[in-house]
């Protein structure tokens, strides 16, 4: 997956720090006070549609096979720059029952971006 | 995650059958002869951005928090209808060395769609 460097406008991963205080979530998240969430942005021209980071998922490869051959409805489907690999992170927080929990929360950090 | 029923144009899962013969992959895939791959299509208006099927992923919730409040650059980020839950499927196929392999292949079937 590409890292955004300001030189290309093709689908890439952009660094982004989230402060829980800034978004008002510090009333339920005890630690950390923030984290590098990152996000995906950039163009997905047809020739890179279906490229999920460094590897292709079977499904996106199949759909792209139809898309590249102009098959309806896939020819009109927008290919999007989305997270293709997310990483968990450990958090200390108040859960639904207002108990303090330390847990690995899934899908917190974007590791890789790709074209859907 | 919504199933497409032809009545709504909001992000949903559309049934789609892939025939390996049709796409010319029957020379290396022994079984099955095809499968219901499905795909995602539909609009992602701002109020449903960040909704991954029935539950929210932490990352998409955080990004949507910024997007809903018009923060740059998230206000301009396209929210996309993409697979949020994929399922593996067992396949019998020839590998590079022409050995017959039976294996669960990840990310074959779209189970749920959501807005990134």
């Amino acid at each position: 997956g590409l890292e955004c460097d300001g030189k290309v406008n093709i689908c890439c991963k952009k660094q982004f720090f989230v402060s829980f205080k800034d978004i008002g979530w510090n009333d339920w998240i005890i630690a950390p006070s923030g984290y590098h969430a990152n996000y995906c942005e950039g163009e997905c021209p047809s020739h890179i549609a279906g490229t999920s980071g460094s590897s292709l998922s079977f499904h996106s490869t199949v759909i792209n096979h139809y898309r590249m051959r102009g098959h309806s409805p896939f020819a009109n489907l927008k290919s999007c720059c989305v997270p293709t690999k997310l990483r968990p992170m450990s958090m200390l927080y108040y859960d639904d029952g207002q108990n303090i929990i330390k847990k690995d929360i899934q899908n917190m950090i974007v590791e890789e971006c790709g074209c859907s | 995650g919504l199933e497409c029923d032809g009545k709504v144009n909001i992000c949903c899962k559309k049934q789609f059958f892939v025939s390996f013969k049709d796409i010319g992959w029957n020379d290396w895939i022994i079984a099955p002869s095809g499968y219901h791959a499905n795909y995602c299509e539909g609009e992602c208006p701002s109020h449903i951005a960040g909704t991954s099927g029935s539950s929210l992923s932490f990352h998409s919730t955080v990004i949507n928090h910024y997007r809903m409040r018009g923060h740059s650059p998230f206000a301009n980020l396209k929210s996309c209808c993409v697979p949020t839950k994929l399922r593996p499927m067992s396949m019998l196929y020839y590998d590079d060395g022409q050995n017959i392999i039976k294996k669960d292949i990840q990310n074959m079937i779209v189970e749920e769609c959501g807005c990134s």
């Epitope: 339920w28 108040y94 029952g97 207002q98 | 929210l56």
Partner: antibody, heavy 122, light 112 residues
Framework: QVQLVQSGAEVKKPGSSVKVSCKAS????????ISWVRQAPGQGLEWMGG????????NYAQKFQGRVTITADESTSTAYMELSSLRSEDTAVYYC???????????????WGQGTLVTVSS | DIVMTQSPLSLPVTPGEPASISCRSS???????????LDWYLQKPGQSPQLLIY???NRASGVPDRFSGSGSGTDFTLKISRVEAEDVGVYYC?????????FGGGTKVEIK
């Protein structure tokens, strides 16, 4: 300390509408689900619907579909439940309840409002 | 919709004695993530409901340890090891696995 403060009791005529408010204080508003639950006199609890505040997505029980509208205003940390075409059977105490963070519809409800009695009578 | 059935309807108890309430769902509340989406609430006379047990067996903050929840799938139990006078009220089970969220009919616990 989190508090959910609901609007006062209402007396309504059949066929009219009622809008009940639920103001949250003592915590952030956005990462939660607000559900509305009603209780007719001497009866049990009945879920009407709710709203996921992060996305503004509302969900209604089939029984109330078309008659209930649940909204939220983040600037005032207030959720609203409007019920239209009122009938005598809608006489009940209406509660708002706040689900845990990022639990969506699969939330547990630790915080509850004090309840709002709505009486429908001609 | 998932139907929640509670028993008994009424439960007269003696302070200091144990008590048990059953809740059965019309379909399994066990999610693939391993959680049972079943909560127990107590509504004391003239008050709003309060959360006792969430996700089948977790005690909510501030709830005395005489309360415990058990069960999985379709059969759940709320136990009070030693009933106290302040425990009177109506106990409800609630499923949150899928919408619409549904409650049991309630069990009224009163002192003998």
């Amino acid at each position: 300390q989190v508090q959910l403060v609901q609007s006062g009791a209402e007396v309504k005529k059949p066929g009219s509408s009622v809008k009940v408010s639920c103001k949250a204080s003592g915590g952030s508003f956005s990462p939660y689900t607000i559900s509305w639950v009603r209780q007719a006199p001497g009866q049990g609890l009945e879920w009407m619907g709710g709203i996921i505040l992060t996305s503004g997505t509302a969900n209604y029980a089939q029984k109330f579909q078309g008659r209930v509208t649940i909204t939220a205003d983040e600037s005032t940390s207030t959720a609203y439940m409007e019920l239209s075409s009122l009938r005598s059977e809608d006489t009940a105490v209406y509660y708002c309840a706040r689900g845990g963070p990022l639990s969506g519809w699969r939330a547990s409800y630790y915080y509850w409002g004090q309840g709002t009695l709505v009486t429908v009578s001609s | 919709d998932i139907v929640m059935t509670q028993s008994p309807l009424s439960l007269p108890v003696t302070p200091g004695e144990p008590a048990s309430i059953s809740c059965r769902s019309s379909q399994s509340l066990l999610h693939s993530n391993g959680y049972n989406y079943l909560d127990w609430y107590l509504q004391k006379p003239g008050q709003s409901p309060q959360l006792l047990i969430y996700l089948g067996s977790n005690r909510a903050s501030g709830v005395p340890d005489r309360f415990s929840g058990s069960g999985s799938g379709t059969d759940f139990t709320l136990k009070i090891s030693r009933v106290e006078a302040e425990d009177v009220g109506v106990y409800y089970c609630m499923q949150a696995l899928q919408t619409p969220i549904t409650f049991g009919g309630g069990t009224k616990v009163e002192i003998k």
